[in-house]
Amino acid sequence: EPCVEVVPNITYQCMELNFYKIPDNLPFSTKNLDLSFNPLRHLGSYSFFSFPELQVLDLSRCEIQTIEDGAYQSLSHLSTLILTGNPIQSLALGAFSGLSSLQKLVAVETNLASLENFPIGHLKTLKELNVAHNLIQSFKLPEYFSNLTNLEHLDLSSNKIQSIYCTDLRVLHQMPLLNLSLDLSLNPMNFIQPGAFKEIRLHKLTLRNNFDSLNVMKTCIQGLAGLEVHRLVLGEFRNEGNLEKFDKSALEGLCNLTIEEFRLAYLDYYLDDIIDLFNCLTNVSSFSLVSVTIERVKDFSYNFGWQHLELVNCKFGQFPTLKLKSLKRLTFTSNKGGNAFSEVDLPSLEFLDLSRNGLSFKGCCSQSDFGTTSLKYLDLSFNGVITMSSNFLGLEQLEHLDFQHSNLKQMSEFSVFLSLRNLIYLDISHTHTRVAFNGIFNGLSSLEVLKMAGNSFQENFLPDIFTELRNLTFLDLSQCQLEQLSPTAFNSLSSLQVLNMSHNNFFSLDTFPYKCLNSLQVLDYSLNHIMTSKKQELQHFPSSLAFLNLTQNDFACTCEHQSFLQWIKDQRQLLVEVERMECATPSDKQGMPVLSLNITCQMNK
Amino acid sequence: QKQYWVCNSSDASISYTYCDKMQYPISINVNPCIELKRSKGLLHIFYIPRRDLKQLYFNLYITVNTMNLPKRKEVICRGSDDDYSFCRALKGETVNTTISFSFKGIKFSKGKYKCVVEAISGSPEEMLFCLEFVILHQPNSN
């Protein structure tokens, strides 16, 4: 069975084809080759000499036991080599020779027992080394690591490392890899020698499910003393063994580290006193809790010095009390409990993401809700009922506003967005908004992107509601049950580039409303019920138009519509997916491609 | 279509068939077997994925005695610092994991429950596997 040609001459997918040897019938120019799940078993020297241009080679689960010297010789452009799931028993010293451009090496689950005799010391370009899920017992980074000056990611998770000694990291003292991210999760750690990480600098250190007791966790974290780390991730996994006990003593050792960003990811334990618990983390710039349960929500009003707080997928008794002077960014998403939003006091806040919480807002939105006048980004999407009772007074700095899939109330009672002259992006898609007031978008003079799909209009008619949106470049009006539109609805949108009118209910196509859209490049009218054109002769769309989508409509392919069908043919160079433009009527032409029709009509009156 | 038996409990019998062409082997054990009136146990899965499990989610299509419920989407792996360790599993890496589950207080009517589980993962998104579970429920008490 042949390989699948994904991109001609470039990408070939040969997965699970029962190949016992490397195929020789693929082009020399192949850059991406997936040979995974084939029983190759043995790689001799110059195995891939037919593919000198290879950049990505996937050899996952190929039952490879032996890799000889120079197996990859000639692959001087290879940047990614994947060897996941091969039971390697014999790895020659020169197995990886010739890989002068290799940036990513994945040797997950390959029976690797030690880094010491892993022959990669010459791979100077290596950025990512993933040796997770192996049998490595020693964390000693071999001397050859001093050659790997570009290394940014080292994944040693799911190995057998129990202890870390001062000598293990000596090579990092000699040549500090300032950008190294290290993942040691799921190693059964019980000892880190104090001083082992002294004066070591890491970009990221991840330690999840490493400790089988509170005491071990405590002493190991104390062993990290002296480490300077940009981002530290601690925590557990839901499907692994979890700590029986967890208290403030666990994290006391963090006072002896220099940490820029901290994240606690999943803990099967109720956090009650976060002030004491995170006492050593009051001055990190970014603090993040993922999938934890928080009992006392008042604690977030303590004077933490965080600039970014992230609470994701957590459980709360009620919406937390948030009073944080220095906070600039708050991400509070996908949390449970506390369904009613309560005011927060965050005077420095610029970025607020409150999406996907099922929250309801009694009144939205003004400065008093968030305790700030600096807000630039506000995401309230995928929540509950949001009642619009104020038009963003004190929030005039807003540039990005997202309400999609929340239930907006009172949207047509006043000009909700009147204050937002700096707003660039607005998404009110699927918000149960019924447009019944022409001033709905008044004030939005800087708006560039407006997404309002999945809403409705009074009498299914699009009125002149965009008159002030002179900078708009993107407008999505799909799924709005629209049937008619004002001939001047788009007259002021001379900068508009993309207009999505798909999935509405237009019976006919009219070019007249688009005559002023001098910048229009994409017009999507797919999934309507267009049968014909409006009575007048169709004009040309703006000359800027490059893509016109008329697929999945109800074209009536009869003589009376001959001029419309001819007009469609004349637009051929603009049309996308023409094969999905089919006749719906009459029955003998149903399913026929509109462009293949040869309509010769004797118009016998 | 070959049917794979999972287990029997006092009020349910559970089996599954593949609903995709690939039919890559997957081993599923539930201990103790699910009782629909109340249950707590461990789900054990052994599987070698044909693509990375990053951003794994399930589409669930549930049918109760021929009545279709709305499609549900269950996100399992968000893509960074996920709850489950198997979210970092790569294509070709053995996934051998045990997940605890518990639910209580749901009353199910007697009959045949079908649940099509479409597992989608990776970027770009593609189907990882598709299984159709059949649960025959025979309430032994009210």
Epitope: E459, Q484, N505, F507 | -
Partner: nanobody, 119 residues
Framework: EVQLVESGGGLVQAGGSLRLSCVAS????????MGWFRQAPGKERDIVAR????????YYAESVRGRFTISRDNAKNTMYLQMNNLRPEDTAVYYC????????????WGQGTQVTVSS
């Protein structure tokens, strides 16, 4: 399952009038487009008229424009076709049609009602 039942067909003289009705059951069709198709002996089935759920939009084939009027009463789940000034060439079986969920066109069909116009 949606069922469409037409009525009102019959024999009429040229120049006369008929009013066809179509009653929908099994689901409220108030938001869906509905329409009338016809098929004359030896001819293809083709659209005559169509109306949107809100009645805002209508479409007529050129041959019936000005003579036929399509309307609907969503409260009664019923659609009508008022046919005036009938001609012999209007003789056909008239079918009631409704769109389906997700905007699927011409999803549901009635059994048809015969209209015969004699000269």
């Amino acid at each position: 399952e949606v069922q469409l039942v037409e009525s009102g067909g019959g024999l009429v003289q040229a120049g006369g009038s008929l009013r066809l009705s179509c009653v929908a059951s099994g689901r409220t069709l108030s938001t869906y487009n509905m329409g009338w198709f016809r098929q004359a002996p030896g001819k293809e089935r083709d659209i005559v008229a169509r109306i949107s759920g809100s009645s805002v939009s209508t479409y007529y084939a050129e041959s019936v424009r000005g003579r036929f009027t399509i309307s609907r009463d969503n409260a009664k789940n019923t659609m009508y076709l008022q046919m005036n000034n009938l001609r012999p060439e209007d003789t056909a079986v008239y079918y009631c049609v409704a769109d389906g969920p997700g905007g699927r066109s011409y999803e549901y069909w009635g059994q048809g009602t015969q209209v015969t116009v004699s000269s």
